[in-house]
């Protein structure tokens, strides 16, 4: 029961996380700037991975996509790549984990197969979460680095002058959504990996040892108990008494493949 709950919860947490990663990737508010030295109107600029928008105090809002823009920084391209890889891995992980869920029966799929699928999806969720966290962190670092650079960086062109405008910048909402979503996906993946351990116990067959007691020969077989259940053929340690010594193979027992000591 605990295994099923852990697996189900891991799936739900990962699902929420991946939905968050998709949302963060699509959001426009990765970084936000307020334009200070502007004598005309208050300008609020916000930028996403795919487009940049401007909103003025007058209510005017305009967004422009980056598709035609040359010279986008490699860092931005790297962030895009990390987020997309995170989404793709997460989506595949979700697909795999649906079939791996213990509560869903698909044909005669064995528990070992479900365990393997659970582990695979768990690893995918972990990598997906790490990709999202890395992508968001790279962007945040790029933002901080660019704004701590000297604003006295001026250069002249055609007799005119270009300089950096004093702006106040903040991390956009998408960064926080991305961090939280990445964390949730990561946690979900860990939960799936933990659930995998419960789904596939180690199959260890221990050979019983024959003890010869004085007077009566006793074959002593340590019994196993079935994981998470109170049933199975050999749930208690049995002593088998009879007139003569027997080999282990002669002792009647019905071992289960999930029995372990």
């Amino acid at each position: 029961m605990a295994v099923t709950a852990c697996q189900g919860l891991g799936f739900v947490v990962s699902l929420i996380g991946i939905a968050g990663i998709i949302a963060a990737t699509c959001m426009d508010q990765w970084s936000t700037q307020d334009l200070y030295n502007n004598p005309v109107t208050a300008v609020f600029n916000y930028q996403g991975l795919w487009r940049s928008c401007v909103r003025e105090s007058s209510g005017f809002t305009e967004c422009r996509g980056y598709f035609t823009l040359l010279g986008l920084p490699a860092m931005l391209q790297a962030v895009r790549a990390l987020m997309i890889v995170g989404i793709v891995l997460g989506a595949i992980g979700l697909l795999v984990s649906i079939f791996a869920l213990k509560c869903i029966r698909i044909g005669s799929m064995e528990d070992s197969a479900k365990a393997n699928m659970t582990l695979t999806s768990g690893i995918m969720f972990i990598v997906s979460g790490l990709c999202a966290i890395a992508g968001v962190s790279v962007f945040a670092n790029m933002l901080v680095t660019n704004f701590w650079m000297s604003t006295a960086n001026m250069y002249t062109g055609m007799g005119g002058m270009v300089q950096t405008v004093q702006t106040r910048y903040t991390f956009g909402a998408a960064l926080f959504v991305g961090w939280v979503a990445g964390g949730l996906t990561l946690i979900g993946g860990v939960m799936m990996c933990i659930a995998c351990r419960g789904l596939a116990p180690e199959e260890t067959n221990y050979k019983a040892v024959s003890y010869h007691a004085s007077g009566h020969s006793v074959a002593y077989k340590p019994g196993g108990f079935k994981a998470s259940t109170g049933f199975g053929s050999n749930t208690k340690n049995k002593k088998i008494y009879d007139g003569g010594a027997r080999t282990e193979d002669e002792v009647q027992s019905y071992p289960s493949k999930h029995d372990y000591v």
Epitope: S31, Q33, L35, N37, N38, V40, T41, V43, N45, Q47, S52, V54, E56, S57, S58, G59, F60, E62, R64, Y66, L69, L70, G71, L72, P73, L76, M142, L143, N146, F147, G160, M161, V162, Q163, T164, V165, T167, Y169
Partner: nanobody, 121 residues
Framework: EVQLVESGGGLVQPGGSLRLSCAAS????????MGWYRQAPGKQREFVAG???????NYAHSVKERFTISRDNAKNTMYLQMNSLKSEDTAGYYC???????????????WGQGTLVTVSA
């Protein structure tokens, strides 16, 4: 990089009119606000008029009702229609633009080289 080029300056009689133009060129992603500033000999540079991307305008008190600012976003060009010119309007007129550069995630303030307007009889 972004460059601004002003044109339309010259000599005009008091009460006359002139139309200045400012064209932006180069690797432009988006220019948010544009403005005109002027600097008379021996004086500080002062704000004349400004216009936002959305069309909001602002004028210095000394030029209100005489000057009209406009812009064409598609062409990245700004205009200043100057009517009823006075001798105190004589100055170098400089174009200013605040351009968003997504490559550096920063605003760049770009200045033109200026055009001279002389109001004299």
């Amino acid at each position: 990089e972004v460059q601004l080029v002003e044109s339309g300056g010259g000599l005009v009689q008091p009460g006359g009119s002139l139309r200045l133009s400012c064209a932006a060129s180069g690797n432009i992603f988006r220019i948010d606000t544009m403005g005109w500033y002027r600097q008379a000999p021996g004086k500080q540079r002062e704000f004349v008029a400004g216009i936002s991307r959305g069309g909001s305008t602002n004028y210095a008190h000394s030029v209100k009702e005489r000057f009209t600012i406009s812009r064409d976003n598609a062409k990245n060009t700004m205009y200043l229609q100057m009517n009823s010119l006075k001798s105190e309007d004589t100055a170098g007129y400089y174009c200013n633009a605040q351009a968003w550069d997504p490559g550096t995630i920063r605003y760049l303030e770009v200045w033109g080289q200026g055009t001279l307007v002389t109001v004299s009889a």
